[in-house]
């Protein structure tokens, strides 16, 4: 079972993503809050960490793939593993980090010039031409996210603004990031007080368009700091 693998000594001290993550080097995997881990002859308390479970690549983050945590392990026990960087071994495209693809068992850079035709061939071979099963999550088996594709229209799922068509940016919306319109003059914008604070937004706005900047609306100067309204204004 998933839990027996997660509790086995075999994965106790692996690096991320199995044995821990940033700030948790070598932490073991636990099966329940506060549970004790059988290490050697005595039990020891361990970090309350559990890898993300999955059955397919689409259930993992865009820079992860779904696989068994142990080589030749139980095929039914799978977790999300960190993607493989350039020149690392691979068995399929999803194993390679964004910007790379799997060629002859090695992750190689997806140079757009030669990559597109080659990847389309592979997809046709592997999945045929039946696109009836495509949905918003089929990003590993179609030309999206990891693979070159037509620029996303408004509302399309994206990873970065370069995935979106002209006049759109990639911004967070609920659980995903989608292409949203770049803000026009007079539209309300978000001014980030400190670097990185945009990461806390649930409905992220795009940036202001060319020649515009996000500034306090003139008639709102007297308002309190927290209620100041920012809009896109000409430089």
């Amino acid at each position: 079972t998933l839990n027996s693998v997660l509790n086995s000594n075999a994965i106790k001290n692996l690096p991320p993503p199995l044995g821990g993550a940033a700030g948790h080097p070598g932490s073991a995997v636990s099966a329940a809050p506060g549970i004790l881990y059988p290490g050697g002859n005595k039990y020891q308390t361990i970090d309350n960490y559990q890898p993300y479970p999955c059955a397919e690549d689409e259930e993992c983050g865009t820079d992860e793939y779904c696989a068994s945590p142990t080589r030749g392990g139980d095929a039914g026990v799978q977790i999300c593993l960190a993607c493989r960087k350039r020149r690392k071994r691979c068995m399929r495209h999803a194993m390679c980090c964004p910007g790379n693809y799997c060629k002859n068992g090695i992750c190689v850079s997806s140079d757009q010039n030669h990559f597109r035709g080659e990847i389309e061939e592979t997809i046709t071979e592997s999945f045929g031409n039946d696109h009836s099963t495509l949905d918003g999550y089929s990003r590993r088996t179609t030309l999206s996210s990891k693979m070159y594709h037509t620029k996303g229209q408004e509302g399309s799922v994206c990873l970065r603004s370069s995935d979106c068509a002209s006049g759109l940016c990639c911004a967070r919306h609920f659980w995903s990031k989608i292409c949203k319109p770049v803000l026009k003059e007079g539209q309300v914008c978000t001014k980030h007080r400190r670097k990185g604070s945009h990461g806390l937004e649930i409905f992220q706005r795009c940036y202001c368009g060319e020649g515009l900047s996000c500034r306090i609306q003139k008639d709102h100067h007297q308002a309190s700091n927290s209620s100041r309204l920012h809009t896109c204004q000409r430089h």
Epitope: Y49, S176, G199
Partner: nanobody, 116 residues
């Protein structure tokens, strides 16, 4: 510090439905996974459902087609809609919030009892 508080558990008859809620505070979008796990008496904790940013939800085989995981980020709340409940679904249900590679933060749990 992240705090997760589950609610919505209780006693329900077989075939019935329940909706569990998990309210998160101190929650930042660095935590880009939310999940539901359960632990029946004398058994190991097992995953029920899990959802990641920009990804398809994961469901354990035993709950596929019966349970649905969702989230309302404006309320910082995750949900588990449980339909067609069976006696074997009886357990303490835990909500979890995940970081980069897995789940780190856990709620205290809410008891779900399926019995006639």
């Amino acid at each position: 510090e992240v705090q997760l508080v589950e609610s919505g558990g209780g006693l329900v008859q077989p075939g019935g439905s329940l909706r569990l809620s998990c309210a998160a505070s101190g929650f930042s979008l660095d935590y880009y996974g939310m999940g539901w796990f359960r632990q029946a008496p004398g058994k190991e904790r097992e995953v029920v459902a899990s959802i990641r940013w920009n990804a398809k939800p994961y469901y354990a085989d035993s709950v596929k087609g019966r349970f649905t995981i969702s989230a309302d980020n404006s309320k910082n709340t995750a949900y588990l809609q449980m339909n067609s409940l069976k006696p074997e679904d009886t357990a303490v249900y835990y909500c979890a919030a995940g970081k980069r590679y897995g789940y780190y933060d856990w709620g205290q749990g809410t008891l779900v009892t399926v019995s006639s």
